[in-house]
Interface confidence: low
C-alpha cells in the first residue's frame, strides 16, 4: 500500500535571468528511494540515482544544477521555462510517487521568490 505523500514548493514565480530551486520531499513512508527523475512536461531534465548519483540531460547541462538534496536548481531562467515540472520518486517497495510544481517566469522585478528550501 502506498502511504507516502509528496510535498513540493507548489506554484512559484521567479524573474527572467534569475534562478530557482525546485524542491520535493517524500514523507510518511519508509520506502527506499531508488531514483528521482525531474521532468518538464515530456522532457527529462535530470536523474538522481541512489547508486549512480546525478545525470543531467545534455541539453540542460548549462542551466540545470543538482540539488540541494534531491531538488533541482534552474539557472538563467527564460520566459520559455514557464510551465509544469514534475519530481518522480521511484521507491521500493511502494512504487512511483509524483509531485507537481508550476513555475512562472516573469519579465518584471515583481516576482516572488517562493522557493526557499524548507526543512521537513
Amino acid at each position: 500500500m502506498m502511504t507516502g505523500t509528496i510535498e513540493t514548493t507548489g506554484n512559484i514565480s521567479a524573474e527572467k535571468g534569475g534562478s530557482i530551486i525546485l524542491q520535493c520531499h517524500l514523507s510518511s513512508t519508509t520506502a527506499q528511494v531508488t531514483q528521482v527523475n525531474w521532468e518538464q512536461q515530456d522532457q527529462l531534465l535530470a536523474i538522481c540515482n541512489a547508486d549512480l548519483g546525478w545525470h543531467i540531460s545534455p541539453s540542460f547541462k548549462d542551466r540545470v544544477a543538482p540539488g540541494p538534496g534531491l531538488g533541482l536548481t534552474l539557472q538563467s531562467l527564460t520566459v520559455n521555462d514557464t510551465g509544469e515540472y514534475f519530481c518522480i520518486y521511484h521507491t521500493y517497495p511502494d512504487g512511483t510517487y509524483t509531485g507537481r510544481i508550476f513555475l512562472e517566469v516573469l519579465e518584471s522585478s515583481v516576482a516572488e521568490h517562493g522557493a526557499r528550501f524548507q526543512i521537513p
Partner: nanobody, 115 residues
Framework: EVQLVESGGGLVQPGGSLRLSCAAS????????MGWFRQAPGKEREWVAS???????WYADSVKGRFTISADNSKNTAYLQMNSLKPEDTAVYYC?????????WGQGTLVTVSS
Amino acid sequence: EVQLVESGGGLVQPGGSLRLSCAASGFDFSVSWMGWFRQAPGKEREWVASVLRGGYTWYADSVKGRFTISADNSKNTAYLQMNSLKPEDTAVYYCAREGSWFDYWGQGTLVTVSS
C-alpha cells in the same frame, strides 16, 4: 550510530574568515551527500551549501563566491570555508547528511560576525 559533530565556530570581525568542520561517523561517508545549513536568531533554518559524491558543489546565492564546501573522505569530514564574512552571516551552522532527505543533523556551531 550516526553522528555528526560540528566545530570551528566563534566570534570573527566583518571581513574575516572561519573554517567549519563536520566530523562524521557511523555511516559510509564516501558515498554520502553532505550539506550545511544555518539558522539565525528568530529565522528559519536555511540551506547554505551542499557537496555530492562525484564532486558536485553548489551554494545559496547569499554565500556564493565567499563560502567553499568540501569533503575529505579519508577523514570522514566535511568543511565549510567562510571568507569575507558579514554580520548577516551570524547564525548557528549545522551540517547534515543527505539521504532521501536530510536525515541526520549535527548539534550546530555558533558563528558570530561582529566588530
